[in-house]
């Protein structure tokens, strides 16, 4: 079920106009310290680095793009779900 949701989000993200994808600064894609429990297990960046990235939405980290994306709560839109629908 979650996999379907992930695929759905990835389709939306990949089909979005470039400005619609909330992508962080390029330098944030550089070397990262490997944190997390267990060998080679990385924590979801949405839980720390991008914890407050989405204003009225939920953060979803798209591994393929190495960038966070926001799923907006009802009535909100924009790359960080900051805009209110009229």
């Amino acid at each position: 079920d979650l996999q379907e949701a992930d695929l759905d989000l990835l389709r939306v993200t990949l089909s979005s106009k470039p400005q619609a994808l909330a992508t962080p600064n390029k330098e944030e894609h550089g070397k990262r310290k490997k944190k997390g429990k267990g060998l080679g297990k990385k924590r979801d960046p949405c839980l720390r680095k991008y914890k407050d990235f989405c204003i009225h939405g939920e953060c979803k980290y798209v591994k393929e793009l190495r960038a966070p994306s926001c799923i907006c709560h009802p009535g909100y839109h924009g790359e960080r779900c900051h805009g209110l629908s009229l």
Partner: antibody, heavy 122, light 113 residues
């Protein structure tokens, strides 16, 4: 499989408070919203409010502000709704439901709990 | 608040009949960002929890029989059951998720003639 297990029937006195629970399983709790809906006997569905466990954001129907308080415990994948200053008007079945998303937006409820019946009587 | 109006309030049908019910919103539910209508349909049988049938006005939820079809745009929406079965007797609710507060219609009760 996705399941929402709600707490059992509640009987409460006028003026008291109750805390209803909704335990989620079968999916990543923080990825979806949990919404609460009221249904009085023989009546329609009334949206109370919702919580997004991931961000902690809550949204309320103005009518239920001060009446309902929504919280979520990520460690146990459980959402709660506290109802205060109970009156007979609060007697109803309360449903929790998972708020799902597609195309980048949340908004519709794809899995529902079995409902908790609350009776307020002296 | 967005007001959702459903009609008729009740509908008496025979098994095998085609049925349509209406849901109207007090303002457009069309999201300009994705050109989709933020409307869902639910079925509730007596003593049961509601069940999602349709979202984005016309997308059928997984596992829902294809006799259920959602259509419409803007403020006018329709749920059609192409050939009613006895198990379809229930109350049907529409719900908007265009903006808060989320609101439901009063429901259409499908009864046996």
């Amino acid at each position: 499989q996705v399941q929402l297990q709600q707490s059992g029937t509640e009987l409460a006195r006028p003026g008291a408070s109750v805390k209803l629970s909704c335990k989620a399983s079968g999916y990543t709790f923080r990825t979806y919203g949990i919404t609460w809906v009221k249904q009085r006997t023989g009546q329609g569905l009334e949206w109370i409010g919702e919580i997004f466990p991931g961000s902690g954001n809550t949204y309320y129907n103005e009518k239920f502000k001060g009446k309902a308080s929504l919280t979520a415990d990520k460690s146990s994948s459980t959402a709660y709704m506290q109802l205060s200053s109970l009156t007979s008007e609060d007697s109803a079945v309360y449903f929790c439901a998972r708020e799902s998303f597609s195309d980048g937006y949340y908004g519709y409820f794809d899995y529902w709990g079995q409902g908790t019946t609350l009776t307020v009587s002296s | 608040d967005i007001v959702m109006s459903q009609s008729p309030s009740s509908l008496a049908v025979s098994v095998g009949e085609k049925v349509t019910m209406s849901c109207k919103s007090s303002q457009s539910l069309l999201y300009s960002t994705n050109q989709k209508n933020s409307l869902a349909w639910y079925q509730q049988k007596p003593g049961q929890s509601p069940k999602l049938l349709i979202y984005w006005a016309s997308t059928r939820e997984s596992g829902v029989p294809d006799r259920f079809t959602g259509s419409g745009s803007g403020t006018d929406f329709t749920l059609t059951i192409s050939s009613v079965k006895a198990e379809d007797l229930a109350v049907y609710y529409c719900q908007q998720y265009y903006r808060y507060p989320l609101t439901f219609g009063a429901g259409t009760k499908l009864e046996l003639k």
